[in-house]
């Protein structure tokens, strides 16, 4: 799986989409985890509706809610109140019993309000530890990035 | 009406390979998963993998993992079950088996082929 | 993977009789996906219920299913000539889709 990457501003919303075969994955509850570490497992965030047929309705936990359309085949999360700490890489998945399929692997970037003049810098990434391999971009505010281009080049 | 129609029976040696298929007609092949069952003479139903014809997505049993390879065609809407090296113990009638779909989700398995009956003799 | 176990393995009975068949899991069957299948001498097996509790196309109402979680039951209600075959419950929750050792519904 390539990564795509979402990038939001600090404080608003965010919307992650994960679009999938609606027939492969037909009956199958969806969810939302973040990865820890390049190796490490993918800690379950937020999961959509017990029962499949009301996947459509949203479901929250704290400021990440889900939502399935199950017809159309895509996943929708939306990270409320974008935070520095939000940052990093999950995974879109599709659930079968108590195993998964990756639809999707995410890389959120968090970029600082325009409108906030604090000294800091202008983006929040994950640690240098965790990987970042054939990553695209799939945002509005965002941009492709080239096979084996470094993401975020060193600034003085 | 959606149909599974299995190839014929099948007498070989053991070492032998083997490719049995079975053709879907009625429906979107592409569109549901396609599954293999095991029946020795005499016993029960045993699940020996599954595939996606849409992408060939496969997933094996852990007893059928190495033993036998999955595969389709989707310009022939056709699925197969194949052996590089049979054995007298893969004697068996052979079914393959459409993932059926509801409203509510997922639907069973339904309809079935008609079963290939697979003889390993020396 | 999620092992199956049906009970009794013969069950012995007069057309007219009711039937009751069970299929515990090892594990939870999340979704019940769970269905149920008969099959008789040289035929391919055929899908009596899915969902634990929803009939299949065709199937008549003398045949229901029932339960949640590890614990499933199949009743035929009025045992008709023809229903005396082999009954097979299956998950198709997680990969492997395991199959129960069957259940035999013979005359008495």
């Known amino acids: 799986h390539n990564t795509t990457v979402f990038q939001g501003v600090e404080g608003q919303s965010l919307q992650v989409s994960c679009p999938y075969d609606s027939m492969k994955h037909w009956g199958r509850r969806k969810a939302w985890c973040r990865q820890l570490g390049e190796k490490g497992p993918c800690q379950r965030v937020v999961s959509t509706h017990n029962l499949w047929l009301l996947s459509f309705l949203r479901r929250r936990n704290g400021s990440t809610a889900i939502t399935d359309d199950t017809l159309g085949g895509t996943l929708t999360i939306t990270l409320r109140n974008l935070q520095p700490h939000d940052a990093g890489f999950y995974q879109c998945q599709s659930l079968h019993g108590s195993e998964a399929d990756t639809l999707r692997k995410v890389l959120v970037e968090v970029l600082a309000d325009p409108l906030d003049h604090r000294d800091a810098g202008d983006l929040w990434v994950p640690g240098e530890s965790e990987s970042f391999e054939d990553a695209h971009v799939e945002h509005s505010i965002s941009r492709s990035l080239l096979e084996g281009e470094i993401p975020f080049p060193p600034t003085s | 009406e959606v149909q599974l129609v299995q190839s014929g029976a099948e007498v070989k040696k053991p070492g032998e390979s083997l490719k049995i298929s079975c053709k879907g007609s009625?429906?979107?092949?592409?569109?549901?998963?396609i599954g293999w069952v095991r029946q020795m003479p005499g016993k029960g139903l045993e699940w020996m993998g599954i595939?996606?014809?849409?992408?060939?997505?496969?997933r094996y049993s852990p007893s059928f993992q190495g033993q036998v390879t999955i595969s389709v065609d989707k310009s022939s809407s056709t699925a197969y079950l194949q052996w590089s090296s049979l054995k007298a113990s893969d004697t068996a009638i052979y079914y393959c088996?459409?993932?059926?779909?509801?409203?509510?989700?997922?639907?069973?398995?339904?309809?079935w082929g008609q079963g290939t009956l697979v003889t390993v003799s020396s | 993977e999620i092992v199956l176990t049906q009970s009794p393995g013969t069950l012995s009975l007069s057309p007219g009789e009711r039937a009751t068949l069970s299929c515990r899991a090892s594990q939870s069957v999340s979704s019940s996906y769970l269905a149920w299948y008969q099959q008789k001498p040289g035929q391919a097996p055929r899908l009596l219920i899915y969902g634990a509790s929803s009939r299949a196309t065709g199937i008549p109402d003398r045949f229901s299913g029932s339960g949640s979680g590890t614990d499933f039951t199949l009743t035929i209600s009025r045992l008709e000539p023809e229903d005396f075959a082999l009954y097979y419950c299956?998950?198709?929750?997680?990969?492997?889709?395991?199959f129960g050792p069957g259940t035999k519904v013979d005359i008495k």
């Open positions: 009625g429906y979107t092949f592409t569109s549901y998963w």
């Open positions: 088996t459409r993932q059926a779909i509801a409203v509510t989700g997922l639907g069973g398995f339904d309809p």
């Open positions: 595939i996606y014809p849409g992408d060939s997505d496969t």
């Open positions: 299956q998950q198709y929750d997680t990969s492997p889709f395991t």
